[in-house]
Interface confidence: low
């Protein structure tokens, strides 16, 4: 089982970043930490998408990783996609500090995110509370600014 993974985020514009993943035990939480730059100040949706396909850019990555066929939600919600990691917050310099601990994603097993795509979005994720159908699918987070395939790290 892999205990560490890494993702380099890139897009068509200025947004780029590096995200690390670490899971010490197969059933334990995954620590997600890193940095994303080139964002507008404020909240940006942050999700693992189903496919590790970036052939046509971030759109090829498909929908949120959702092996349990649930509605979209926030990272602390029972009703959420496995890939729902919530939002990252960019400061006035456009840099987001990513410091997350999540017990739903995994680096092995049915919820394994390795080989899938991590995406940072244009707008804030409403965490499924937006009151429209799109909220229950994407959180109304808008376009995909940057993405990268999550790979095994040393």
């Amino acid at each position: 089982m892999a205990t560490k993974a890494v993702c380099v985020l890139k897009g068509d514009g200025p947004v780029q970043g590096i995200i690390n993943f670490e899971q010490k035990e197969s059933n334990g939480p995954v620590k997600v930490w890193g940095s994303i730059k080139g964002l507008t100040e404020g909240l940006h949706g942050f999700h693992v998408h189903e496919f590790g396909d970036n052939t046509a850019g971030c759109t090829s990555a498909g929908p949120h990783f959702n092996p349990l066929s649930r509605k979209h939600g926030g990272p602390k919600d029972e009703e959420r996609h496995v890939g729902d990691l919530g939002n990252v917050t960019a400061d006035k310099d456009g840099v987001a500090d990513v410091s997350i601990e999540d017990s739903v994603i995994s680096l092995s097993g049915d919820h394994c995110i390795i080989g899938r795509t991590l995406v940072v979005h244009e707008k804030a994720d409403d965490l499924g509370k937006g009151g429209n159908e799109e909220s229950t699918k994407t959180g109304n987070a808008g376009s995909r600014l940057a993405c990268g395939v999550i790979g095994i790290a040393q």
């Epitope: 590096i18 940095s35 840099v95 410091s99």
Partner: antibody, heavy 117, light 107 residues
């Protein structure tokens, strides 16, 4: 503007504990971690560890494991670093800093802790 | 732990000089490198993050480059206020570690 204001200088005896505070303002406290770094006289910078204000996750340098505790109080936007079982070689200036990804972009003014019998 | 080695440990230079400081990591750290300026009695100041990104408010005479294990901080034209000690810091893995520092002194 972002500011980190630390508590004043302390003089402690060997074996005692010290608790340094760091009050943040000018940004959303829970959106960034807080790192602690020290500098002993005539030495370089030494990273002690960090705490995620969002979920209280901590990561301490092995050297300080078991002797240091980092905490936060979101109601007052204040971070704390407690160091126990002080020794003379813990004499240093202790800095808090806002952790942003892989760097520390704003720093407190530093707190001098002197350990002397 | 990842060791960070800076060179030189000190450099004497004049105003207007181009100064280059190097930092070598004991293993690959990708772009997880920051540079700080530290003056006596003051808090350290972030200059460069993610190896080459200039922190806002920092003069453009400061630049960073490199990835993997070898990194460089360049001051294109040294100014009187630049005399200080400079530190590199890696954030590829915990514990974060600093280089031993490079003191830039007046010649």
């Amino acid at each position: 503007q972002v500011q980190l204001v630390q508590s004043g200088a302390e003089v402690k005896k060997p074996g005692a504990s010290v608790k340094v505070s760091c009050k943040a303002s000018g940004y959303t406290f829970t959106s960034f971690g807080i790192s602690w770094v020290r500098q002993a006289p005539g030495q370089g910078l030494e990273w002690m560890g960090w705490i995620s204000v969002y979920n209280d996750y901590t990561n301490y340098a092995q050297k300080f494991q078991g002797r240091v505790t980092m905490t936060t109080d979101t109601s007052t936007s204040t971070a704390y670093m407690e160091l126990r079982s002080l020794r003379s070689d813990d004499t240093a200036v202790y800095y808090c800093a806002r952790k942003r990804g892989g760097d520390m972009d704003y720093w407190g003014q530093g707190t001098l802790v002197t350990v002397s019998s | 732990d990842i060791q960070m080695t800076q060179s030189p440990s000190s450099v004497s230079a004049s105003v207007g000089d181009r100064v280059t400081i190097t930092c070598r990591a004991s293993q690959d750290i990708s772009s997880w490198l920051a540079w700080y300026q530290h003056k006596p009695g003051k808090a350290p100041k972030l200059l460069i993050y993610l190896a080459s990104s200039l922190q806002s408010g920092v003069p453009s005479r400061f630049s960073g480059s490199g990835s993997g294990t070898d990194f460089t901080l360049t001051i294109s034209s040294l100014q009187p206020e630049d005399f200080a000690t400079y530190y590199c810091q890696q954030a590829n893995s915990f514990p974060w570690t600093f280089g031993q520092g490079t003191k830039v002194e007046i010649k």
